[in-house]
């Protein structure tokens, strides 16, 4: 004999000893019908704010308040936004690796320093993790260039830099 709880819709709960579909109480939800209980809705407070409010069929979704970003599945925690010279990774904010920079506050990824030699120019000011290199005026006489291979932290990928 089929249990009538099997016919219950999401947003309801049903107990086998009294197989009647009942609506989820306030601040609870059930995304699958026929369950014996509804789940308690997530509350977004403190560093969290509501991205999506709870309904009888779906849990609430949280996001982080201004100046913070989510970490972990379903935004389980909030971390302060990255500073210039850093980029966001799963592990949180990491300093830009050698040969890259990020001049943005809170967003963006580390990007490579400009290769001045592509435009036939010399490096006037070397780059930092927060600032790109500053290229000088075009070089008139080209001396042989030396290629320095800079390996990004932790990996075999080389960043090709030209020193003139």
């Amino acid at each position: 004999v089929q249990n009538s709880c099997d016919n219950c819709q999401p947003g309801t709960f049903c107990r086998k000893y009294n197989p009647v579909c009942k609506s989820c109480p306030p601040s609870t939800f059930s995304s699958i019908g026929g369950q014996p209980n509804c789940n308690i809705c997530r509350v977004c407070a403190g560093y969290f704010r509501f991205k999506k409010f709870c309904s009888s069929t779906h849990n609430a979704e949280c996001e982080c308040i201004e100046g913070f970003h989510c970490l972990g599945p379903q935004c389980t925690r909030c971390e302060k936004d990255c500073r210039p010279g850093q980029e966001l990774t799963k592990q949180g904010c990491k300093t830009c690796s050698l040969g890259t920079f990020n001049d943005q506050n809170g967003t963006g990824v580390c990007r490579p320093w400009t290769n001045c030699s592509l435009d036939g120019r010399s490096v006037l000011k070397t780059g930092t993790t927060e600032k790109d290199v500053v290229c000088g005026p075009p070089v008139v006489s080209f001396s042989p260039s030396t290629t320095i291979s800079v390996t990004p932290e932790g990996g075999p990928g080389g960043h090709s830099l030209q020193v003139l």
Partner: antibody, heavy 121, light 111 residues
Amino acid sequence: EVQLVESGGGLVQPGGSLRLSCAASGYTFTSYYIYWVRQAPGKGLEWIGNIWPGNGGTFYGEKFMGRATFSADTSKNTAYLQMNSLRAEDTAVYYCARRPDYSGDDYFDYWGQGTLVTVSS
Amino acid sequence: SVELTQPPSVSVSPGQTARITCKLNSGNIGSYYVHWYQQKPGQAPVTMIYRDDKRPDGIPERFSGSSDSSSNSAFLTISGVQAEDEADYYCHSYDSTITPVFGGGTKLTVL
């Protein structure tokens, strides 16, 4: 709609070179990394390197240093891969892909259709 | 350096659940985002799961991503497998934020 369209593949003699194009549209070309990835017949995906079109900055996989060169023409929203001294083992489908600006360890959200390069005499 | 290991093949009957493993050789799986791509013959890869467990628009709910710290592995789970799911699946992470690393790929066969 974001699109990456590749061209330039074909038959190349051993020792020869290739120049592949990756034409981007539907987004700000200078604000996203373009990665180059290849796939030999029946094999997995292999990273060649990547370029930041905004300033021409490049990174190369160790295996491809000195043999591959990336460039970008921002007026044409196109990235290029030049590869020299080609060998039979360079026969592969070459893909360009875009990485979002969310995090440093993010996925590739758009891929080109791929272009087949065959190195053979 | 970081390496990702996948089984070469997984077979499953239609309607069953397929689970593809991506094992990290060093470090902690919880420290790395893992992304999953599906590739059918003659086509470019398509993102199925990104940032561990997120599904792009248009990808069926049958596809889900997870990880397990005890086995240091990430998983792509396909519930209610359909014939059209037959393809190669690749996991993807990073050795550094510059250097992407791919698993060797898993061929999913729907019996």
